[in-house]
Amino acid sequence: TSSASSSSSSAPFLASAASAQPPLPDQCPALCECSEAARTVKCVNRNLTEVPTDLPLYVRNLFLTGNQLAVLPAGAFARRPPLAELAALNLSGSRLDEVRGGAFEHLPSLRQLDLSHNPLAYLSPFAFSGSNASISAPSPLVELILNHIVPPDDKRQNRSFEGMVAAALVAGRALQGLHLLELASNHFLYLPRDVLAQLPSLRYLDLSNNSLVSLTYVSFRNLTHLESLHLEDNALKVLHNGTLAELQGLPHVRVFLDNNPWVCDCHMADMVTWLKQTGVVQGKDRLTCAFPEKMRNRVLLELNSADLDCDPILPPSLQTS
């Protein structure tokens, strides 16, 4: 393992590598640790403000975590010759607030990308597709990890955060080969319609620890390869028949529904019936009611139709203050 730990006197990293000299095959950038045997470069917790230009050509796994990158420009990893072996890129916790279109272009082997724990005020629609064409060249990405990328409220753009992320996921249909998508802990209130329709190859989808209230307008129908769907720790109140039927129709899926505030009233009857007969839900015996108060902590699987009633709504003429 070689490492280069230089002081502040080391030459600053260039913003663009277009004019940079090709790196020596075994060169290790300042402030990084390199292992050619493991094909790994780690530039971790070094307060880097830019991606090193002189990354070794052998790099297959690149860790740029815990830095202060702020912005990933177009072609941030473009090199001559290209980093043709780079397969896994971890940029988590690097204070990124802007990822521009084409940021990951010229990485032909990039299979796994982790942008978690960056407060992304701006994620270009073309961050992953690289172009604004209606149909882009397929991205090589197989795993995309976007946990906790929601910016603080004061840094949000006018448009919805959910919409911004969705636009990047569907642009150019570039991510049709994506197998794994993690979107946990992003304060999502809803999942934009048609996003999942553009991701037909998903095997693993993590939407846990968001604020999803309903899945009524979400279609899982075409996710025929889905094996794990994580919906724990959301704000789901009930799953309606359409959603239940779609989940039941997915041949290999397992759904995780723990820690949602299930409302056990008359609208819950179909879901309870479904839970009792389905093998789709993992840990279904742990699901409990949160509302109404009289039902709190009751186990869904133990409920029957007589338990699930709705208070009659008084006609306006009978309502009193």
Epitope: S201, R203, E227, S228, H252, G279, Q282
Partner: antibody, heavy 115, light 107 residues
Framework: EVQLVQSGAEVKKPGESLKISCKGS????????IGWVRQMPGKGLEWMGI????????RYSPSFQGQVTISADKSISTAYLQWSSLKASDTGMYYC????????WGQGTLVTVSS | AIQLTQSPSSLSASVGDRVTITCRAS??????LAWYQQKPGKAPKLLIY???NLESGVPSRFSGSGSGTDFTLTISSLQPEDFATYYC?????????FGQGTKLEIK
């Protein structure tokens, strides 16, 4: 990096029992199905069955139902294929593979059953 | 169980040739078909799924087509590393059967 590492080659006599293993790493083992495939010497691939390690739900090919048992221990990220009474016709290479679409494969375990 | 029949069982071709392998299902399997490549002494490798979707990292000279019961794998310009055995597999219903294989040899 996703890896499936299988146990080593086995030489057994007819009637003996055997349990071979497949250890997954580099991914969430409990979140993807794991399948087993047999390849007899000089022959093609045969789908034996799959298991979801998260809840040990297993599906078998009718050709192998009752002949083998597929199991998993999620605490050590390992899937198993076992026989209670081997036959000479069980000789072959056995592969484990991840996901219903077998996107990653183990290196194979050669099982030889001979008296 | 759904049966898959590949043809031809073996095939001789030269580098640069265009090669087509077919797979016929005994009943309709929608688009639930995959193709694998296996080289001697190695584990198989997923090439294509859902009839025509290329697995990440697979060269674009490989392509798949078809629907219902009849499917094809095409290699547009054979490379030396493509000489291997190819299998189709259906995952429309259990058991997820394989075809018997097509051995692609150097002419």
């Amino acid at each position: 990096e996703v890896q499936l590492v299988q146990s080593g080659a086995e030489v057994k006599k007819p009637g003996e029992s055997l349990k071979i293993s497949c250890k997954g790493s580099g991914y969430r083992f409990t979140s993807y199905w794991i399948g087993w495939v047999r390849q007899m010497p000089g022959k093609g691939l045969e789908w034996m069955g799959i298991i979801y390690p998260g809840d040990s739900d297993a599906r078998y090919s009718p050709s192998f139902q009752g002949q083998v048992t597929i199991s998993a221990d999620k605490s050590i990220s390992t899937a198993y294929l076992q026989w209670s009474s081997l036959k000479a016709s069980d000789t072959g290479m056995y592969y484990c593979a991840r996901s219903v679409l077998f996107d990653y494969w183990g290196q194979g375990t050669l099982v030889t059953v001979s008296s | 169980a759904i049966q898959l029949t590949q043809s031809p069982s073996s095939l001789s071709a030269s580098v640069g040739d265009r090669v087509t392998i077919t797979c016929r299902a005994s009943q309709g399997i929608s688009s639930a078909l995959a193709w694998y490549q296996q080289k001697p002494g190695k584990a198989p490798k997923l090439l294509i799924y859902d009839v025509s979707n290329l697995e990440s990292g697979v060269p674009s000279r490989f392509s798949g087509s078809g629907s219902g019961t009849d499917f094809t794998l095409t290699i547009s310009s054979l490379q030396p590393e493509d000489f291997a055995t190819y299998y189709c597999q259906q995952f429309n219903s259990y058991p997820h059967t394989f075809g018997q294989g097509t051995k692609l040899e150097i002419k």
